[in-house]
Interface confidence: low
């Protein structure tokens, strides 16, 4: 049979993409359940994910209130079936997370090339302005709304028949690139926040090639 011994959570890790933010930890509980608390450096603790057997807690609703704040979370371990019990020091065991600043650390999600339109020797490529879970006036802000000109996109493009890539950059969501008339090109985009020290770049968008239905051609 089980015992009432609880162990502290460990390997507390923030997983965050486009501000969707989850705290993960170990171990999968045997003799215990977990409750998570989160706060800003100067704020009060707020409890989330009460008495769960899961080893993750979605904290998005809390961090999107102010993505430029620095947050700290802690995971409490309670004996299963007796959540009023405390540890030997008179309080439940807990472990602190690393600090997390969403604006500086959330991963940039994989971008999507929304459309491309060729007019003669120019191609206009538009990257989808992804919606985040950050709200303002009851509407969800886009990635561009949140990061403004801190966010740039890099476009990598090449002739379908060769492998030599060219690049273009924009601090909007649109590129205008020069191409050879009658030649098919492929491209992918990457989101970048140059001012960051970590998580500066997103993964590459799926590759799109001219001649596929997403594109449009006009002479």
């Amino acid at each position: 049979s089980g015992t009432t011994n609880t162990v502290a959570a460990y390997n507390l890790t923030w997983k965050s993409t486009n501000f969707k933010t989850i705290l993960e930890w170990e171990p999968k509980p045997v003799n215990q359940v977990y409750t998570v608390q989160i706060s800003t450096k100067s704020g009060d603790w707020k409890s989330k994910c009460f008495y769960t057997t899961d080893t993750e807690c979605d904290l998005t609703d809390e961090i999107v209130k102010d993505v430029k704040q620095t947050y700290l979370a802690r995971v409490f371990s309670y004996p299963a079936g007796n959540v009023e019990s405390t540890g030997s020091a008179g309080e439940p065991l807990y472990e602190n997370s690393p600090e997390f600043t969403p604006y500086l650390e959330t991963n940039l999600g994989q971008p999507t090339i929304q459309s491309f339109e060729q007019v003669g020797t120019k191609v206009n490529v538009t990257v989808e302005d992804e919606r985040t879970l950050v709200r303002r006036n009851n509407t969800f802000l886009s990635l561009r709304d949140v990061f403004g000109k801190d966010l740039i996109y890099t476009l990598y493009y090449w002739k379908s028949s060769s492998s030599g890539k060219k690049t273009a950059k924009t601090n909007t969501n649109e590129f205008l690139i020069d191409v050879e008339k009658g030649v098919s090109y492929c491209f992918f985009a990457q989101a970048v926040i140059p001012s960051r020290t970590v998580n500066r770049k997103s993964t590459d968008s799926p590759v799109e090639c001219m001649g596929q239905e997403k594109g449009e051609f006009r002479e």
Partner: antibody, heavy 125, light 108 residues
Framework: QVQLQESGPGLVKPSQTLSLTCTVS?????????WSWIRQHPGKGLEWIGE???????RYNPSLKSRVTISVDTSKNQFSLKLSSVTAADTAVYYC??????????????????WGKGTTVTVSS | EIVLTQSPGTLSLSPGERATLSCRAS???????LAWYQQKPGQAPRLLIY???SRATGIPDRFSGSGSGTDFTLTISRLEPEDFAVYYC?????????FGGGTKVEIK
């Protein structure tokens, strides 16, 4: 009682993505269990692929992690496996299973108490 | 990764005999995470024992489990014809969850 049923194509071409779905009947996928995928290569032992909690929390086998995605659709009472860039080495019987946290006398015990019948997936061109 | 080593690979016994199957872990495993399964040809595994020693619902009492730490044992006190199958131990505590290589119990 709870039953699991795997479904999906039995033949997948190399380099493509294997997609399987496990439908849970006789109970709710949101009832606090973990839901796993396991495979068994022909004539071999069992290999755990990964699991998902009804909330969406996932754990994957590190040897497959770069190619595996497990997702849950609580509205359909289903969870799914996607395995990308498959090769002949991914030919196997694929099982879905329920990984139950059973509470007894102050502790949780974990075990896979309900399994699907398994579906054979062959990777071949 | 916790490696579970089962021995023997094959056990040749007659009905009515006692079968003792071993599962050794490369590092300590909480008994809460240790389970035993039976698999017959063409079928999915069936849970026999969980928590190292607790019988699953509907499992006859001739099946028993014991052990802790790194050494676990499944015992079938008196083999019935339907018991001839492959038996696997499994740990579901540390990712990746792992199975032993299996012990085949065959009719002598």
């Amino acid at each position: 009682q709870v039953q699991l049923q795997e479904s999906g194509p039995g033949l997948v071409k190399p380099s493509q993505t294997l997609s399987l779905t496990c439908t849970v009947s006789g109970g709710s996928i949101s009832s606090g269990q973990y839901w796993s995928w396991i495979r068994q290569h022909p004539g071999k032992g069992l290999e755990w692929i990964g699991e998902i909690y009804y909330s969406g929390s996932t754990r994957y086998n590190p040897s497959l992690k770069s190619r595996v995605t497990i997702s849950v659709d609580t509205s359909k009472n289903q969870f799914s496996l996607k395995l990308s860039s498959v090769t002949a080495a991914d030919t196997a019987v694929y099982y879905c299973a329920r990984d139950t946290p059973y509470y007894y006398d102050g502790g949780y015990y974990y075990y896979m108490d309900v399994w699907g019948k398994g579906t054979t997936v062959t990777v071949s061109s | 990764e916790i490696v579970l080593t089962q021995s023997p690979g094959t056990l040749s016994l007659s009905p009515g005999e006692r079968a003792t199957l071993s599962c050794r872990a490369s590092q300590s495993v909480s008994s809460s995470y240790l389970a035993w399964y039976q698999q017959k040809p063409g079928q999915a595994p069936r849970l026999l024992i969980y928590g190292a020693s607790s019988r699953a619902t509907g499992i006859p009492d001739r099946f028993s489990g014991s052990g802790s730490g790194t050494d676990f044992t499944l015992t079938i006190s008196r083999l019935e014809p339907e018991d001839f199958a492959v038996y696997y131990c499994q740990q579901v505590g540390v990712v990746p969850y792992t199975f032993g290589g299996g012990t085949k119990v065959e009719i002598k």
